[in-house]
């Protein structure tokens, strides 16, 4: 019997605390053979899809979602999901993006190190039905 699809992971580069106006890239990772990665914002009704999927390792594929100039409205919870035909995966844990005013001081670091764990990672609510994601029927709004 085919195993269930592994949950994707999500991380942010260069980190999860980003100065206003700086860039951030969300990285979604899953198994090889992924057709589409989706980055969901806060709720399932707001998401971006990409089929620009690259192989990160022999067993892993990834997609990158970049925000060139972060605004306050970009702060919030993000998570990934993917479609590996003919099934959708479960969602990843949430990753919280924080946007801060740029202090510009030489002693204040611009960002925290990129990580897919730590205090900014929150468990998903797991209310998602792995085989029929609840975003079905909702309009795709662009994240950025």
């Amino acid at each position: 019997q085919e195993e269930d699809l592994p949950r994707p992971s999500i991380s942010a580069e260069p980190g999860t605390v980003i100065p206003l106006g700086s860039h951030v890239t969300f990285v979604c990772r899953g198994p090889v053979g992924v057709q589409t990665f989706r980055l969901e914002r806060d709720s399932r009704s707001t998401y971006n899809d990409t089929e620009d999927v690259s192989q990160a390792s022999p067993s892993e594929s990834e997609a990158r979602f970049r925000i060139d100039s972060v605004r306050e409205g970009n702060a919030g919870l993000y998570r990934c999901i993917y479609y590996k035909p003919p099934k959708w995966s479960e969602q990843s844990d949430y990753l919280e993006l924080l946007v801060k005013e740029s202090s510009g001081g030489p002693d204040s670091p611009d960002t925290e190190p990129g990580s897919s764990a730590g205090p900014t990672q929150r468990p998903s609510d797991n209310s998602h039905n792995e085989h029929a994601p609840a975003s079905q029927g909702l309009k795709a709004e662009h994240l950025y």
Epitope: E2, Q35, I81, Y83, P85, P86, K87, A132, P133, S135
Partner: antibody, heavy 121, light 107 residues
Framework: QVQLQQSGAELARPGTSVKLSCKAS????????LSWVKQRTGQGLEWIGE????????YYSDKVKDKATLTADKSSSTAYMELRSLTSEDSAVYFC??????????????WGQGTSVTVSS | DIVLTQSPATLSVTPGDSVSLSCRAS??????LHWYQQKSHESPRLLIK???QSISGIPSRFSGSGSGTDFTLSINSVETEDFGMYFC?????????FGAGTKLELK
């Protein structure tokens, strides 16, 4: 509205090949997959394979790996299925169906009208 | 490959009857099961997705239930336009497979 327009009936000799087409309209061709399904007279439905026009990825039933080849032309929003080395067993109606997954589920939600293929000497 | 077994093969009913069609999978497929209707000389039409989710434009008398290996399509008060073949299909894994179908006919 979503439409899948399939090519006309084919009469072919044993051992030859045919290429069936399925022209999609009413949606973004590259945002969905395209499945092909076989139905012999009075029989059930048999999945042949599926292609994703956005990147050309395709998946086949083991039964037809040496029989069918799926392709897609993004510029004309048309999918194709070539059947080769035809035998009487390939005489059937062939349907194309949109494999819709964009909004987070998967199902063959729209179907073409079918193309009848008759293999006879 | 996942085998889907539909029963009964034929169901003879009178308009107004309520009926249940069964589809059993050879292994657990969660809720990755869809139902299609096919009338004579027509293309299949999607009725129910993911075992129980309704489809826009499909009459509310059609409903689905089940999970794992056992699934049911119910038609509440059959109408004459409902006669034809009904197929279940799984999308849990490649290759996609269909059941052999249940023929709903007039008694």
């Amino acid at each position: 509205q979503v439409q899948l327009q399939q090519s006309g009936a084919e009469l072919a000799r044993p051992g030859t090949s045919v290429k069936l087409s399925c022209k999609a309209s009413g949606y973004t061709f590259t945002s969905c997959g395209l499945s092909w399904v076989k139905q012999r007279t009075g029989q059930g439905l048999e999945w042949i394979g599926e292609i994703y026009p956005s990147n050309g990825n395709s998946y086949y039933s083991d039964k037809v790996k040496d029989k069918a080849t799926l392709t897609a032309d993004k510029s004309s929003s048309t999918a194709y299925m070539e059947l080769r080395s035809l035998t009487s067993e390939d005489s059937a109606v062939y349907f194309c169906a949109r494999a819709y997954y964009t909004n987070g589920y998967y199902a063959m939600d729209y179907w073409g009208q079918g193309t009848s293929v008759t293999v006879s000497s | 490959d996942i085998v889907l077994t539909q029963s009964p093969a034929t169901l003879s009913v009178t308009p107004g009857d309520s009926v249940s069609l069964s589809c059993r999978a050879s292994q657990s497929i969660s809720n990755n099961l869809h139902w299609y209707q096919q009338k004579s000389h027509e293309s299949p039409r999607l009725l129910i997705k993911y075992a129980s989710q309704s489809i826009s434009g499909i009459p509310s008398r059609f409903s689905g239930s089940g999970s794992g290996t056992d699934f049911t399509l119910s038609i509440n008060s059959v109408e004459t336009e409902d006669f034809g073949m009904y197929f279940c299909q799984q999308s849990n894994s490649w290759p996609l497979t269909f059941g052999a179908g249940t023929k709903l006919e007039l008694k």
